[in-house]
């Protein structure tokens, strides 16, 4: 079971690509995360 903490995890755009080792994560909640994250309960657990 994945642990997925909506408050402490950060997010990176999948398709933007990275310039070699310069990866940028943002700490803002993705607008569709509330829709998206619970849709596969077998693979993740949301910790409030």
């Amino acid at each position: 079971m994945e642990d997925f903490n909506m408050e402490s995890d950060s997010f990176e755009d999948f398709w933007k690509g990275e310039d070699l080792s310069n990866y940028s994560y943002s700490s803002t909640l993705p607008p569709f995360l509330l829709d998206a994250a619970p849709c596969e309960p077998e693979s993740l657990e949301i910790n409030k």
Partner: antibody, heavy 120, light 116 residues
Framework: QVQLVQSGAEVKKPGSSVKVSCKAS????????ISWVRQAPGQGPEWMGW????????NYAQKFQGRVTMTRDTSISTAYMELSRLRPDDTAVYYC?????????????WGQGTLVTVSS | QAVLTQPSSLSASPGASVSLTCTLR?????????IYWYQQKPGSPPQFLLR?????????GSGVPSRFSGSRDASANAGILLISGLRSEDEADYYC?????????FGGGTQLTVLG
Amino acid sequence: QVQLVQSGAEVKKPGSSVKVSCKASGGTLSSYAISWVRQAPGQGPEWMGWINPNSGGTNYAQKFQGRVTMTRDTSISTAYMELSRLRPDDTAVYYCASGFCTRTICFVYWGQGTLVTVSS
Amino acid sequence: QAVLTQPSSLSASPGASVSLTCTLRSGINVGAYRIYWYQQKPGSPPQFLLRYKSDSDKQQGSGVPSRFSGSRDASANAGILLISGLRSEDEADYYCAIWHSSAWVFGGGTQLTVLG
């Protein structure tokens, strides 16, 4: 649950244009890039470019520069890909895709695909 | 020479472990790139499996079983997708991809056949 729902199959004449739509159902387009990827029959995927739904900024693959235009209408949570000056070798399934990653897991969403056939 | 080269086909028996390779063109160092892996079955879009750069920089696709894992072979300048405990439903085409020169580049794909 987020779904990307694409417009239906198209048959086009060489030299014409096609515009494919991609609607986010069950969520917004979000701030994450929407990529367009095409796949010709029996071939591997080919990336065409992406659009940032927030800013409308685009990044097109060099091969498609000048022939592709990616736009979005945030009011209806829909992205568009228009390809002009169509040739028979543009016959392919066109997909939109979006997603984001945390440090351990990635959520990636694909449209069901739109078959575009270019034939005289 | 293609940026990414994959063997065109591979066959293995159920229960086996298989390694699918994605070789980067000479001059493009595998250690500098995240290698992305996709599975595609007929009539469906590609599905993201995982991406791998190192053991400290790897992400699994949502819902993808842990029997799909990534690694790299620096000496061969290749990314590797390892599938353990092969199942009949793993029969599919597998594509690798990298972000290179401000564009996504896909390999030609490997068609994996599960025997029997």
